[in-house]
């Protein structure tokens, strides 16, 4: 990895577990200001592999609300608007980081957690295995 | 929101900015143990809206490496294997949380940051605007 010189103005840490426990400022900085205003909000309906969005809420997690995509069909929508099973709708998954309250119910103590979420669906050609 | 009784065993915080600055344990807990072994690793190639994955590295961010999807075509791949421009390949984007070193180069002090990443691509019917 890249070695970065330490900033002399860094907060001090006497913690023997350092750097496993760190200080995090929860005032979120949003770097998405220059993103395209034409957001992907309607893609779930217009896709050939459309999906529904399910709300997953957990007050012990930050963010507490995560939206999970579930493909509407096993096949994909063809040009006639019918479901075509020669193609497959599959979820696109991504591992994301969330903060889990630890110990539970603590407002100022968290542990980093990795979870797998389905973000949307895409249409793929199936791998077909025929019986000999 | 849901009010949760505070755990009496929580770490104490005298910080006047509390709960804006919190303690986070970086020993990541991975909750993906029961995920489907059939991972989405090859979907980028088999999709009718295929994509390439670009490595985005930033040592001031945690995680320092994020993979960004970029759709290979403006159109979608049809049954003949050709790009069909009557349909559009579009990126599925998701806002994720990352930790940004703050002040810069500090190993144990971070700020929560929200960034928009492209996870994969999906094929959508275009919105056609006809000239009057």
């Amino acid at each position: 990895g890249i070695t970065i010189p330490r900033n002399p103005g860094c907060p001090n840490s006497e913690d023997k577990n350092f750097p496993r426990t760190v200080m995090v400022n929860l005032n979120i900085h949003n770097r998405n200001t220059n993103t395209n205003p034409k957001r992907s909000s309607d893609y779930y309906n217009r896709s050939t592999s459309p999906w529904n969005l399910h709300r997953n809420e957990d007050p012990e997690r930050y963010p507490s609300v995560i939206w999970e995509a579930k493909c509407r069909h096993l096949g994909c929508i063809n040009a006639d608007g019918n479901v075509d099973y020669h193609m497959n709708s599959v979820p696109i998954q991504q591992e994301i980081l969330v903060l889990r309250r630890e110990p539970p119910h603590c407002p100022n103590s968290f542990r980093l957690e990795k979870i797998l979420v389905s973000v949307g669906c895409t249409c793929v050609t199936p791998i077909v295995h025929h019986v000999a | 929101g849901i009010t949760i009784p505070r755990n009496p065993g929580c770490p104490n915080s005298e910080d006047k900015n509390f709960p804006r600055t919190v303690m986070v344990n970086l020993n990541i807990h991975n909750r993906n143990t029961n995920t489907n072994p059939k991972r989405s690793s090859d979907y980028y190639n088999r999709s009718t809206s295929p994509w390439n994955l670009h490595r985005n590295e930033d040592p001031e961010r945690y995680p320092s490496v994020i993979w960004e999807a970029k759709c290979r075509h403006l159109g979608c791949i049809n049954a003949d294997g050709n790009v069909d421009y009557h349909m559009n390949s579009v990126p599925i984007q998701q806002e994720i949380l990352v930790l940004r070193r703050e002040p810069p180069h500090c190993p144990n002090s971070f700020r929560l940051e929200k960034i928009l990443v492209s996870v994969g691509c999906t094929c959508v019917t275009p919105i056609v605007h006809h000239v009057a």
Epitope: H73, G75, G81 | P37
Partner: antibody, heavy 120, light 111 residues
Framework: DVQLQESGPGLVKPSQTLSLTCTVS?????????WSWIRQPPGKGLEWIGY???????SYNPSLKSRVTISVDTSKNQFSLKLSSVTAADTAVYYC?????????????WGQGTSVTVSS | DVVMTQTPLSLPVTLGQPASISCRSS???????????LHWYLQKPGQSPRLLIY???NRFSGVPDRFSGSGSGTDFTLKISRVEAEDLGVYYC????????FGGGTKLEIK
């Protein structure tokens, strides 16, 4: 529990269109389910005809696709089957069924079936 | 089309004894999403089919635990640990990975 009831004429002439309706009770149409038609010729096995989702998206058995139309009327809690240009080979018991479309993609509740004979 | 082949065609059994039905598909039933959409139904005389097992091995609500499903890829089995009189009828395997198709049926009858 959800109940499904097929209705329609028991006798259809060759070359005509067979029309059946399925009325769903004790359940509102939602995106979690697809609504299917299956048939069973006398003394034979089951053949899936097609389904329609809450939003009107359909999928048909390729062998019947050119002759089949399935439609839905959510306001009446009904969905319908039309099979055109029928022949004696279309004589069967026709079942409507609810397909769980959220979890396991199969028919979990069926109507009791209606017998249709194609004959002049 | 995916062809589902069931064996045997007819299965004479003694009440209280186990029974096993086999189902083979002409191509793998593993969907691109990793799931296998293979299901089992029972059709009793004069009745409509009733779902027993979904996605290979999951018992539908109200189905007794003497019924179990297993298998993967193209080969699947339905087992009844101890056959009861109410289990008699025609058993169908069905797949919904590549639209819906059914096996030809296996008739479970008293020996």
């Amino acid at each position: 529990d959800v109940q499904l009831q097929e209705s329609g004429p028991g006798l259809v002439k060759p070359s005509q269109t067979l029309s059946l309706t399925c009325t769903v009770s004790s359940y509102s149409f939602t995106s979690d389910y697809a609504w299917s038609w299956i048939r069973q010729p006398p003394g034979k096995g089951l053949e899936w005809i097609g389904y329609i989702t809450y939003s009107g998206v359909t999928s048909y058995n390729p062998s019947l696709k050119s002759r089949v139309t399935i439609s839905v009327d959510t306001s009446k809690n009904q969905f319908s089957l039309k099979l055109s240009s029928v022949t004696a080979a279309d004589t069967a018991v026709y079942y409507c069924a609810r397909a769980d479309y959220d979890s396991y993609y199969t028919m979990d509740y069926w109507g009791q079936g209606t017998s249709v004979t194609v004959s002049s | 089309d995916v062809v589902m082949t069931q064996t045997p065609l007819s299965l004479p059994v003694t009440l209280g004894q186990p029974a096993s039905i086999s189902c083979r598909s002409s191509q793998s039933l593993v969907h691109s999403n990793g799931n296998t959409y293979l299901h089992w139904y029972l059709q009793k005389p004069g009745q409509s089919p009733r779902l027993l097992i979904y996605k290979v091995s999951n018992r539908f609500s109200g189905v007794p635990d003497r019924f179990s499903g297993s298998g993967s890829g193209t080969d699947f089995t339905l087992k009844i640990s101890r056959v009861e009189a109410e289990d008699l009828g025609v058993y169908y395997c069905s797949q919904s990975t590549h639209f819906w198709t059914f096996g030809g049926g296996t008739k479970l009858e008293i020996k």
